[in-house]
Structure formats: structure tokens, C-alpha cells
């Protein structure tokens, strides 16, 4: 299973449920469907409030069991470590794939987490994160921006994904702009 | 008691086709995602195949892939494994298990000319 | 492919207590609780001993046990018996693989 991993204002948006979580035991597998839960201990949420209604406290993260189908495998024993966690609702319950963004909370840059905590939304309606990945691309729109981490640097870890966001200018128009300048 | 019970294995030629069965009894046969595993003779055993409880996922050895399909029938607690293009490395006793526990009592698979 | 790494034989003595590990990845044994051991003694069929890494299915003797630790997983025969003698397997549900096995312990019970 391969995937071009998001920019973390894409994750944000495209997602249903955007929150932070310590992942506290071993992944249980279902005998029916064979997919995976892991017990997790939400500490904050950042999208999903009006998705999630009342049940607003996530127990598990769901997600296939196996490699070949995109399952997430979580690596870290670290059952104090917090992690970010963009995934899609299914009836209710939280699902990942290796595709999703989760990432360790300490791992984020501080414009990451600012980002999460409150600027990306402010994107995610009009803007659109358009990822390059050969030469040459061309903006399809003024709402886009160019996300050239990857063709310059090989890594979803480039200047634009770590310290930038795609915001509206003015109607009709998004550009990048430093989450540093977002500081309330 | 959970039990299963294999047939439908024989000698078949290099590039024939066999079809296995499995009857399943004594517990809820669409709960349970089942799998085929294999002993040639004189060896350890091999993972073949899954199918989840609803049929609607498949997974396969890449020793098998694109020659081998399993299928379930919920309504006949029955579980398939359809065999293709067989070759001679196939031959071993074929059992049907459920996850992650109960096997059945297997059926010999022998392919040779 | 052996995935789980057991060793090719053990032996004890009547009465003696003896241990079968099985070795594998975080990505088997180590991640998950789903090790089952296997006894199977020639032109049998295997014999489910140890589920779930340590739980025993009604009419297996309690001299049979399971335990893991990190991604070792491991079977304890104790008060051997001559009837004990047997092929022993280690399983393992993968996140790569689905299932995976170890490649067997060929278990003899001396005198």
C-alpha cells in the first residue's frame, strides 16, 4: 500500500476527526472482519465536534489489519506519547489507514500545532493545498497553492508542510502564509 | 464442539484444477473470518489463504496469488478454496481453520503426472 | 518463509518440566496477543493447545501453559509425559503475513 502522505492542512480538512491521543494498549483484531481497533485516551479534539455530537469522547481508532490493505500499524511503546490524528468517521467510529496523518504531537512543528489548533480551518473552504510532483505544474485556480515540498525536497517534511498554511487573501484567492504571522 | 471438516482433495495433474470444501459446525460461521493452511509432506506448516466473516475480503500467500481463490457460502457454513494451475510444490494436506483457533482435520492435495 | 524462529528439538526426562519459545517481530508476536501453540503428532492433524498466548481450550491439560514476553513468545510443558511427545508449532496473527507459523520443535520425551 503506497500513498503520497498529505499536507497537514490537506489532513485537516479532508478529515472528520482531528484530534490529539495517547494510544494505551495493544491492537485488539475483530474475528469477523479482520480489522484492528487500538485503545486510545483522547486529550484533545480539534475537528469533529458537530460530526461526533454527543459522543464526543474516542475510545478506539479502527483501522485494517493488515499491511497489504493499508492498515496502520502503531510502532511506539510509548503509551505516555500524545499523537495527532486525522481520520475519517465510518457509523460512528474513528478510521485510519497508513494514509492518514498521524504523527507524534512532539514531532509537529510549533506552526504545525498552531495550525491544527486553529488556523487550518480557516483554509479549508475555499483553499486548496495542490501538490506538485513533477515539473512543471501550473495553479489550476486562484484558490490553489503550488506544494512543492516533495519535488524539491523528497520529504512531506519541507518548509511549506512544517511552517505555512494555505490561506484566503481576498475572494478568489489563496496563498501560502507563515502560521507564524497567525499568532493571536 | 466447533468442528470442520475438509474434502474435496486427490490427485490431480501439473496445471489442473481442485476444489477444496470445508463444512463448518458448532458455532456462528459468518462471526468468524477462516483461513487454509497447508503441510507439504515432511514440513512445517504454511498460511494459504483468509476470508473475512462477511466474504467480502480476501487475502493470499504470494505463493498462491492469482492461482488460488477463496470463497465462503454463510447460508451452507461452507468454506471454499478454488485451485488453479496447480504445480507439484502444491502438494500437501490442506486444512481448513477458523481465526485464530480450530483447524479441521485436513485433506491431501497431491499434484503429479 | 519461517516467519517465527523456533528451535528444531528439545528433550526431558519423564516428570521434567521443559520450555518451547518462539521468536518473532514487533510486527507479530511482539504487537499483538494472538500467539497460539500446536501439537501435532505424526499423520495427525494439530491440535490446538494455547490460544491468545496463554489461554488453554476445555480439555487440555494444565500442564500445558503460555506466556510471552517483548516478541518471544513461549510453551511450557510441565510433569512430562511420554504422550507429550510431538511436533509443537507456534502461531502468530501478522500484520504483514495475516498468519504466520514457526517452523516447528520436535518435542522427545527420554527413557
Known amino acids: 500500500c503506497t500513498c503520497v502522505p498529505p499536507h497537514p492542512q490537506t489532513a485537516f480538512c479532508n478529515s472528520d476527526l482531528v484530534i490529539r491521543a495517547k494510544f494505551v494498549g495493544t491492537p485488539e483484531v475483530n474475528q469477523t472482519t479482520l480489522y484492528q481497533r487500538y485503545e486510545i485516551k483522547m486529550t484533545k479534539m480539534y475537528k469533529g465536534f458537530q460530526a461526533l455530537g454527543d459522543a464526543a469522547d474516542i475510545r478506539f481508532v479502527y483501522t485494517p489489519a493488515m499491511e497489504s490493505v493499508c492498515g496502520y500499524f502503531h510502532r511506539s511503546h510509548n503509551r505516555s506519547e500524545e499523537f495527532l490524528i486525522a481520520g475519517k468517521l465510518q457509523d460512528g467510529l474513528l478510521h485510519i489507514t497508513t494514509c492518514s496523518f498521524v504523527a507524534p504531537w512532539n514531532s509537529l512543528s510549533l506552526a504545525q500545532r498552531r495550525g491544527f489548533t486553529k488556523t487550518y480551518t480557516v483554509g479549508c473552504e475555499e483553499c486548496t493545498v495542490f501538490p506538485c510532483l513533477s515539473i512543471p505544474c501550473k495553479l489550476q485556480s486562484g484558490t490553489h497553492c503550488l506544494w512543492t515540498d516533495q519535488l524539491l525536497q523528497g520529504s512531506e517534511k519541507g518548509f511549506q508542510s512544517r511552517h505555512l498554511a494555505c490561506l484566503p487573501r481576498e475572494p478568489g484567492l489563496c496563498t501560502w502564509q507563515s502560521l507564524r504571522s497567525q499568532i493571536a | 464442539q466447533v468442528q470442520l471438516v475438509e474434502s474435496g482433495g486427490g490427485l490431480v495433474q501439473p496445471g489442473g484444477s481442485l476444489r477444496l470444501s470445508c463444512a463448518a459446525s458448532?458455532?456462528?460461521?459468518?462471526?468468524?473470518?477462516m483461513s487454509w493452511v497447508r503441510q507439504a509432506p515432511g514440513k512445517g506448516l504454511e498460511w494459504v489463504s483468509a476470508?473475512?466473516?462477511?466474504?467480502?475480503?480476501?487475502y493470499y500467500a504470494d505463493s498462491v496469488k492469482g492461482r488460488f481463490t477463496i470463497s465462503r457460502d454463510n447460508s451452507k457454513n461452507t468454506l471454499y478454496l478454488q485451485m488453479n494451475s496447480l504445480r507439484a510444490e502444491d502438494t500437501a494436506v490442506y486444512y481448513c481453520?477458523?481465526?485464530?483457533?480450530?483447524w479441521g482435520q485436513g485433506t491431501l492435495v497431491t499434484v503429479s503426472s | 518463509d519461517i516467519a517465527l524462529t523456533q528451535p528444531a528439538s528439545v528433550s526431558g526426562s519423564p516428570g521434567q518440566s521443559i520450555t518451547i519459545s518462539c521468536t518473532g517481530t514487533s510486527s507479530d508476536v511482539g504487537g499483538y496477543n494472538y500467539v497460539s501453540w500446536y501439537q501435532q503428532h505424526p499423520g495427525k492433524a494439530p491440535k490446538l493447545m494455547i490460544y491468545?498466548?496463554?489461554n488453554r481450550p476445555s480439555g487440555v491439560s494444565n500442564r500445558f501453559s503460555g506466556s510471552k514476553s517483548g516478541n518471544t513468545a513461549s510453551l511450557t510443558i510441565s510433569g512430562l509425559q511420554a504422550e507429550d511427545e510431538a511436533d509443537y508449532y507456534c502461531?502468530?496473527?501478522?500484520?504483514?503475513?495475516?498468519?504466520?507459523f514457526g517452523g516447528g520443535t520436535k518435542l522427545t520425551v527420554l527413557g
Open positions: 502461531q502468530s496473527y501478522d500484520f504483514i503475513n495475516v498468519i504466520v
Open positions: 481453520a477458523r481465526f485464530f483457533d480450530y
Open positions: 476470508i473475512s466473516g462477511s466474504g467480502g475480503s480476501t
Open positions: 458448532g458455532f456462528t460461521f459468518s462471526s468468524y473470518a
Open positions: 491468545d498466548v496463554s
